[in-house]
Interface confidence: medium
């Protein structure tokens, strides 16, 4: 692929794990033991675009599948989505800005923004079995803070 | 300001194991999207890289060198070491430990903090 | 194992352009990044991701890569631009440099 990766798992600031929720949709809850094994993994690309020293472009791809993380407006209203796409030209240094999010890492813990739509954050509710999704505000109820785990590739 | 400072024994004799730190100051080595590397330069020559650490430990070497290569990290001391062993005169460089940011070379964020280097000669 | 090269040397003209080329297998799919080192001092990072500048580097160095080869450029060339020029790419888990370009500000 034109963009190394690095594969890691992604967990909110209350340890839920992110899993599959049919074929498009990721949901958030609490795993242990060998039901960890259910979380996605996701490819993290580094990409170009508008980056300080705390905000760094990012694309969030399912390792090993055809799908990315992006951001549309759905009835005027920003949403997050898994999007498929041809695996020959995924991942790629210049990706469109509906994949882009931006890692803002502050006391190693991680908020990703919308590069599309800024100040809207990949989220997370406080109750379980909840799908993820793109939330317009910060340090409310809904959770948009995460910790990474690498994984090996 | 992130600086770093490199610090060992500047004679090393042939055989033996050549051990250096780098204190990080003025940031944590434990940010989890830096990475710490190595690099040395022999006299004249050109820039080498010897490895890279993160601060979970995990470790990437130059395969030339991975034998002889040890690097490792002290959280507590904020600071991160090399140990580079069965030296020759080959190994006489400048030292130069590093930061890279965003956890993996391929980020191509590349090593934006470097110390002022430190002179081994095996002898 | 991916190998760098790079020109031993370039000259330039002060207030010219220099230009200096990095050249390996696929490169332009991977991310480049260019560093400056003057005689005695430890080296600078110039250019990130290809062709991106840290802050307080100059708008007169530029970076591009695409094909097999980078290049670095540097407008109005001044003589505090003279020094040797590293490229730096990533392969397989391992930090590659290339040669070093020595430019000199005639």
């Known amino acids: 692929a034109p963009v190394r990766s690095l594969n890691c798992t992604l967990r909110d600031s209350q340890q839920k794990s992110l899993v599959m929720s049919g074929p498009y949709e990721l949901k958030a809850l609490h795993l242990q033991g060998q039901d960890m094994e259910q979380q996605v993994v996701f490819s993290m690309s580094f990409v170009q675009g508008e980056e300080s020293n705390d905000k760094i472009p990012v694309a969030l791809g399912l390792k090993e599948k055809n799908l990315y993380l992006s951001c549309v407006l759905k009835d005027d209203k920003p949403t997050l989505q898994l999007e498929s796409v041809d695996p020959k030209n995924y991942p790629k240094k210049k990706m469109e800005k509906r994949f882009v999010f931006n890692k803002i890492e502050i006391n190693n813990k991680l908020e990703f923004e919308s590069a599309q739509f800024p100040n809207w954050y990949i989220s997370t509710s406080q109750a379980e079995n909840m799908p993820v999704f793109l939330g317009g505000t910060k340090g409310g109820q809904d959770i948009t803070d995460f910790t990474m785990q690498f994984v090996s590739s | 300001q992130l600086q770093l400072q490199e610090s060992g024994p500047g004679l090393v004799k042939p055989s033996e194991t050549l051990s250096l730190t780098c204190t990080v100051s003025?940031?944590?080595?434990?940010?989890?999207?830096?990475?710490w590397g190595w690099i040395r330069q022999p006299p004249g020559k050109g820039l080498e890289w010897m490895g890279n650490i993160y601060y979970s430990g995990s470790t990437h070497y130059n395969p030339s060198l991975k034998s002889r290569v040890t690097i490792s990290v002290d959280t507590s001391k904020n600071q991160f070491s090399l140990k580079l062993s069965s030296v020759t005169a080959a190994d006489t460089a400048v030292f130069y430990c590093?930061?890279?940011?965003?956890?993996?070379?391929?980020?191509?964020?590349?090593?934006?903090?470097w110390g002022q280097g430190t002179t081994v000669t095996v002898s | 194992s991916y190998e760098l090269t790079q020109p031993p040397s370039v000259s330039v003209s002060p207030g010219q352009t220099a230009s200096i080329t990095c050249s390996g297998d696929?490169?332009?799919?991977?991310?480049v990044c260019w560093y400056q080192q003057k005689p005695g001092q430890s080296p600078v990072l110039v250019i990130f991701?290809?062709?991106r500048r840290p802050s307080g580097i100059p708008e007169r160095f530029s970076g591009s890569n695409s094909g097999n080869t980078a290049t670095l450029t540097i407008s109005g060339t001044q003589a505090m631009d003279e020094a040797d020029y590293y490229c730096q790419a990533w392969d397989t888990s391992t930090v590659i440099f290339g040669g070093g370009t020595k430019l000199t500000v005639l």
């Open positions: 590093a930061k890279g940011r965003e956890y993996i070379s391929s980020s191509g964020y590349g090593m934006d903090v």
């Open positions: 991701q290809d062709s």
């Open positions: 003025g940031g944590s080595i434990s940010r989890s999207s830096y990475y």
């Open positions: 696929k490169l332009g799919n991977k991310y």
